[in-house]
């Protein structure tokens, strides 16, 4: 008799999930010698322990604490780049500007980036068929709780000037319901963070509007100001040129506004 299995609305665990996490851990420690003290097997065991045999709608931040402890990492607190709805450009940027870090440049973010995972209550099986969707099923699912936990810790660690890359092509350039809007903004520490600088990335070639005047950006400014953190905003009119100028700052065309 086949066992009844809960059908969730979201995609199932990424295929070869355990091997992928283990392989990424090995790869990360290879690239980052400062993390070579990490025991990747222990990291996997802690990751697995956070969600295996647990109801995938009943995951807590506490479940991830053993993993958080093993993945503790010091990044320069004044070199943090947050992003919202524009991950690829943010990652391209930190690949060039090697002294700046997104969450996915840290071990834990790197391990989980673009992956989905969940288990089932009372069985040691990973569910490769379906996992809970944040909207349609539940918010306390393994993936959402993981990102909420690591995002909170990342924001709490930030200091001095924190940068955030925002997608100027979206109807809500700043979205209160995004991870940035709902978690990171509220966990920046005013006693450590002096300024949040937003970089609004333009999509259209001929878009010369000042998107820093967008109502949602004004809303972000208001939230940040109320938290006693200064706010500044820059338009990045030409993201392609912006990246090129990060690579080659001496280029004569890089003195003009990007």
């Amino acid at each position: 008799v086949p066992r009844w299995r809960q059908q969730w609305s979201g995609p199932g665990t990424t295929k070869r999930f355990p091997e992928t996490v283990l392989a990424r851990c090995v790869k990360y420690t290879e690239i980052h010698p400062e993390m070579r003290h990490v025991d990747c097997q222990s990291v996997w065991d802690a990751f697995k322990g956070a969600f295996i045999s647990k109801h995938p709608c009943n995951i807590t931040e506490e479940d991830y604490q053993p993993l958080m402890k093993l993945g503790t990492q010091t990044v320069p607190c004044n070199k943090i780049l947050l992003w919202s709805r524009i991950k690829d450009l943010a990652h391209q940027f930190t690949q060039v500007q090697r002294d700046m870090f997104t969450l996915e440049d840290t071990l834990l973010g790197y391990l989980a980036d673009d992956l989905t995972w969940c288990g089932e209550f009372n069985t040691s099986k990973i569910n490769y068929q379906s996992c809970p969707d944040w909207r349609k099923d539940c918010s306390n699912n393994p993936v959402s709780v993981f990102w909420k936990t690591v995002s909170r810790r990342f924001a709490e660690a930030a200091c001095d000037v924190v940068h955030v890359m925002l997608n100027g092509s979206r109807s809500k350039i700043f979205d209160k319901n995004s991870t940035f809007g709902s978690v990171e903004v509220h966990n920046l520490q005013p006693e450590k963070v002096q300024t949040l600088e937003a970089w609004v990335i333009h999509g259209g070639r001929e878009d010369s509007r000042d998107l820093c005047q967008d109502p949602t950006i004004k809303e972000l400014e208001s939230i940040i100001s109320k938290r006693n953190i200064q706010f500044s905003c820059k338009n990045i009119y030409r993201p392609d040129k912006f990246l090129q100028c990060v690579k080659n700052p001496e280029d004569s065309s890089c003195t003009s506004e990007i």
Partner: nanobody, 122 residues
Framework: EVQLLESGGGLVQPGGSLRLSCTAS????????MSWVRQAPGKGLEWVSG????????YYADNVKGRFIISRDNSKNTLDLQMNSLRAEDTAVYYC???????????????RGQGTLVTVSS
């Protein structure tokens, strides 16, 4: 180029002991999990034991648990397998392998050495 060189095999009587060693080169030894697998004459490959990259976690097949001890020295790039209370059924070619680790069901292996023969016979 990854190289794994096993040594320490030989003929031993039932109940006896043997210590296998594996010297690794061509990769960052300390970031890889390591394991021992074996192949008995006319049989398939069988996973024997594994150890995590920092040596924190060790794993054993049920039929060697309590008799074999796996260890590693990351400063010397070496992996050892201390085999005690050897039985005739332990006769096999023993291979050292580097990999990603153990997920509870599967040992993820990347590279394997040439092997060393262990014969348990009176």
């Amino acid at each position: 180029e990854v190289q794994l060189l096993e040594s320490g095999g030989g003929l031993v009587q039932p109940g006896g002991s043997l210590r296998l060693s594996c010297t690794a080169s061509g990769f960052i030894f300390s970031i890889y999990a390591m394991s021992w697998v074996r192949q008995a004459p006319g049989k398939g490959l069988e996973w024997v034991s594994g150890i995590s990259n920092r040596g924190v976690n060790t794993y054993y097949a049920d039929n060697v648990k309590g008799r074999f001890i796996i260890s590693r020295d990351n400063s010397k790039n070496t992996l050892d397998l201390q085999m005690n209370s050897l039985r005739a059924e332990d006769t096999a070619v023993y291979y050292c392998a580097s990999g990603k680790g153990w997920d509870g069901n599967t040992w993820y292996e990347d590279y394997r050495g040439q092997g060393t023969l262990v014969t348990v016979s009176s």
